[in-house]
Amino acid sequence: FPMFKRGRCLCIGPGVKAVKVADIEKASIMYPSNNCDKIEVIITLKENKGQRCLNPKSKQARLIIKKVERKNF
């Protein structure tokens, strides 16, 4: 996407507060890096309905982050 500067976060704004659990295909956690200084939670929706950013401060995001971290470590 040539219209975007390098070194930007993937999400625009704070993100949605919640996504229906039944609609979630996958959750990806992007940790702070040189490109983006905050954690981002990206939800892939079922049935090719695209992706949404989940507010990392929301209760649902905190649960997802915990779950992912437990699985990875």
Partner: nanobody
């Protein structure tokens, strides 16, 4: 009830300028990105800019970079689109839209947005 109301369109000569406004109500303004789109007769709706209400970050289509500037006044829940050096090909109905939880790759895609205004006509005469 969510409302987006555009204003500021009109008839202007090529080379002139316009400032479009989009007044939002019925939702938490800071939680949303506000996109500007345009649709010329017989053409598809085209994304021209997007602004994050929470931090003011802006995104533009290559075709309008340098001529279009989006800004927001969060105290008034209003987003502006300043259009300079207008060309006849800028003639279209201009719409603002609000979307939440967008990735930057979705910033200019109309299907990513949840709420839409009724549009304001911009006509550029040569």
């Amino acid at each position: 009830e969510v409302q987006l109301v555009e204003s500021g369109g009109g008839l202007v000569q090529a080379g002139g300028s316009l400032r479009l406004s989009c007044a939002a109500s019925g939702f938490t303004f800071d939680d949303y990105a506000i996109g500007w789109f345009r649709q010329a007769p017989g053409k598809e709706r085209e994304g021209v800019s997007c602004i994050s209400s929470s931090d003011g970050d802006t995104y533009y289509a290559d075709s309008v970079k340098g001529r279009f500037t989006a800004s927001s006044d969060n105290a008034k829940n209003t987003v502006y689109l300043q259009i300079n050096s207008l060309k006849p090909e800028d003639t279209a109905v201009y719409y603002c839209a609000a979307g939440q939880g967008l990735l930057i790759a979705q910033a200019l895609r109309w299907e990513s947005y949840d709420y839409w205004g009724q549009g304001t006509q911009v006509t550029v005469s040569s």
